[in-house]
């Protein structure tokens, strides 16, 4: 993927500084495994510059390769909770719409830990909506230094 | 956040390539939970290009959104050490000065593991000093491939 | 490290957009602890833009500071597998050739977990080949959302 001559002449801002860092707003209703996110300076240190939120889900507005990262910490958790005393807890980040592009991008199980954290590079297209599905019966922490989700445009 | 016309005309270097990757130097004295870092080519593969070290703590010299990442591995550790025989071990990365901007940015507990690793996007300002506080009674590894801390400027 | 005047005049593409995200192809033969990677749109969401693969190992083609990231999930794994019933499982990412630059960049043990994920900034040079060595007797998952390895050029 090369930049066109036109792109090379444009100011840097138009090449894509799209970036977002979100904090957990709430979990979904009973049959909805999705986490619902929020962002904005009024909320603390979360922000959206380019991407947008659609009912708590992150929607991409610029094509490109993105670094996607996430950390989720389970609330009131011990290694006992996650391993033996509760249903296995898994976090999956994926494109959930449009349906034609639905795919799991990143998946982690908590096993005997109470936090998962990872990151990956992935191509995303304008209109892709990312969902973060938490299965299991343990509640995620809403502390902003324990649970967060973000994307960063890195290349056309 | 848009680049000003003046910024658009400046050479790329002035837009901010600030970046640092540090290795563990030592832990603090008894009542000081902070980890003390060091960086520079003479030490191996660590470096500072822009940010600086102030008594082992990382100080930011350019405003912007940064990707902050860290990995800490506990020395002489087994899952037994972290779960049953010691005070819970937690790592927190935060702005510790100026006091008016003090906040926890990233927090992880070791639970039954011996390594934590995570990353997040966060706005930082010139003069912010980042501290990495390790609570608990287990010593962190000084191996440069096991324990490291870094920041990367990604956007104004 | 400053950009030369010549570099400042070059189109942005020549400053380095080098980036790759790989998926697991296969493990090595008996005495070879290396993981063998593959990438390309035909395989899914993996890609190489700049770096190249040499017999399943990632080779760098442009000098610079890179963000290296990896996630490896063990297949058919439980916390019991990784802790008590198997040889300790460890993942190390390093420069394996040229031999003169051989070094371990990133090392993680699975302990009682089934996934490791981390990232770090490191200087890499044209011709450096990165190897990912998995020790232990547990097989890594080939699911593309569970096991992946990538690099991103971030600065000259």
């Amino acid at each position: 993927q090369r930049l066109s001559r036109a792109q090379q002449q444009l100011p840097l801002e138009s090449l894509g500084w799209d970036i977002a860092e979100l904090q957990l707003n709430h979990t979904g209703p009973q049959q909805d495994p999705r986490l619902y996110w929020q962002g904005g300076p009024a909320l603390g240190r979360s922000f959206l510059h380019g991407p947008e939120l659609d009912k708590g889900q992150l929607r991409i507005r610029r094509d490109g390769i993105y670094m996607v990262h996430i950390q989720v910490t389970l609330a009131i958790c011990s290694s006992t909770s996650t391993s033996r005393h509760h249903h296995p807890t898994t976090l999956a980040v994926g494109i959930c719409s449009p349906a034609s592009r639905s795919i799991s991008l990143l998946r982690l199980s908590f096993h005997q830990g109470c936090t998962i954290a990872s990151q990956r590079l992935t191509p995303l297209a304008r209109g892709d909506t990312l969902c973060t599905n938490l299965t299991g019966t343990l509640l995620p922490s809403r502390n902003t230094d324990e649970t967060f989700f973000g994307v960063q445009w890195v290349r056309p | 956040q848009r680049l000003s016309r003046a910024q658009q005309q400046l050479p790329l270097e002035s837009l901010g390539w600030d970046i640092a990757e540090l290795q563990l130097n030592h832990t603090g004295p008894q009542q000081d939970p902070r980890l003390y870092w060091q960086g520079g080519p003479a030490l191996g593969r660590s470096f500072l290009h822009g940010p600086e070290l102030d008594k082992g703590q990382l100080r930011i010299r350019r405003d912007g959104i940064y990707m902050v990442h860290i990995q800490v591995t506990l020395a002489i550790c087994s899952s037994t050490s972290t779960s049953r025989h010691h005070h819970p071990t937690t790592l927190a990365v935060g702005i510790c000065s100026p006091a008016s901007r003090s906040i926890s940015l990233l927090r992880l507990s070791f639970h039954q593991g011996c390594t934590i690793a995570s990353q997040r996007l966060t706005p930082l300002a010139r003069g912010d000093t980042l501290c990495t506080n390790l609570t608990g009674t287990l010593l962190p590894s000084r191996n440069t491939d096991e324990t490291f801390f870094g920041v990367q400027w990604v956007r104004p | 490290q400053r950009l030369s005047r010549a570099q400042q005049q070059l189109p942005l593409e020549s400053l380095g957009w080098d980036i790759a995200e790989l998926q697991l192809n296969h493990t090595g033969p008996q005495q070879d602890p290396r993981l063998y990677w593959q990438g390309g749109p035909a395989l899914g969401r993996s890609f190489l833009h700049g770096p190249e693969l040499d017999k399943g190992q990632l080779r760098i083609r442009r000098d610079g500071i890179y963000m290296v990231h990896i996630q490896v999930t063990l297949a058919i794994c439980s916390s019991t597998s990784t802790s008590r019933h198997h040889h300790p499982t460890t993942l190390a990412v390093g420069i394996c050739s040229p031999a003169s630059r051989s070094i371990s960049l990133l090392r993680l043990s699975f302990h009682q977990g089934c996934t490791i994920a981390s990232q770090r900034l490191t200087p890499l040079a044209r011709g450096d080949t990165l190897c990912t060595n998995l020790t232990g007797t547990l097989l890594p998952s080939r699911n593309t959302d569970e096991t992946f390895f990538g690099v991103q050029w971030v600065r000259p």
Epitope: T27, P29, Q30, I76, H85, H87, S141 | - | -
Partner: antibody, heavy 119, light 111 residues
């Protein structure tokens, strides 16, 4: 529809044991922990413990730890709560309960089983 | 164990009037961005019914005249306009740690 159906009332003598069953339906049995809560006549509610049907592991209120055992039979989606060394103050309605999404609060309850301990 | 203290023990309120029940925990039940306090309604001969979870979330199917508030150690259940079918005993419960404990109950009657 989630349902929790408990076994019938029991009368026991002091020192004996009682085993109350709770059959769950309407959801995947091995997903949600099942808790036991008791209520003495005219009194409040008391949490006794819970069991995770996926593994059979249980957590007990320290007050009952030496006398209570919770087990499960995944083939019939049934959990059991056995209380031993019964005393008159164990006379109560025993409820099983589970949750709808996250653990910690109880959206679904059994109808209750009255256990009377009397000589 | 965390001790839950409800007040008042009983409450008589006119139909259509507001009823307020308080619950105090012996130490904070708030952590990780939540308050682990839940409220139940129990009518004679029936099991308890969940009304409010995590301090202020209305359980599905519960009339919106019920609301919860509070954080830390002090919590309130409010019935904004008492109806005849609201006559019952109300319990608070925490799930901050094991063992979970309940308040002693508040009996609500019509004046």
């Amino acid at each position: 529809e989630v349902q929790m159906v408990q076994s019938g009332a029991e009368v026991k003598k002091p020192g004996a044991s009682v085993k109350v069953s709770c059959k769950a339906s309407g959801y995947t049995f091995t997903t949600y922990n099942i808790h036991w809560v008791r209520q003495a006549p005219g009194q409040g509610l008391e949490w006794m413990g819970d069991i995770y049907p996926g593994t059979g592991d249980a957590s007990y209120n320290q007050k009952f730890r030496d006398r209570v055992t919770m087990t499960r039979d995944t083939s019939t989606s049934t959990v059991y709560m056995e209380l031993s060394s019964l005393r008159s103050e164990d006379t109560a309605v025993y409820y099983c309960a589970t949750f709808s999404r996250f653990d910690g609060w109880f959206a679904y309850w059994g109808q209750g089983t009255l256990v009377t301990v009397s000589s | 164990d965390i001790v839950m203290t409800q007040s008042p023990d009983s409450l008589a309120v006119s139909l259509g009037e507001r009823a307020t029940i308080n619950c105090r925990a012996s130490r904070s039940v708030s952590t990780s961005g939540y308050s682990y306090m839940h409220w139940y309604q129990q009518k004679p001969g029936q099991p308890p019914k969940l009304l409010i979870y995590l301090a202020d979330n209305l359980e599905s199917g519960v009339p919106d005249r019920f609301s919860g508030s509070g954080s830390g150690t002090d919590f309130t259940l409010t019935i904004s306009s008492l109806q005849a079918e609201d006559v019952a005993v109300y319990y608070c419960q925490h799930s901050r740690e094991l063992p979970y404990t309940f308040g002693g109950g508040t009996k609500v009657e019509i004046k």
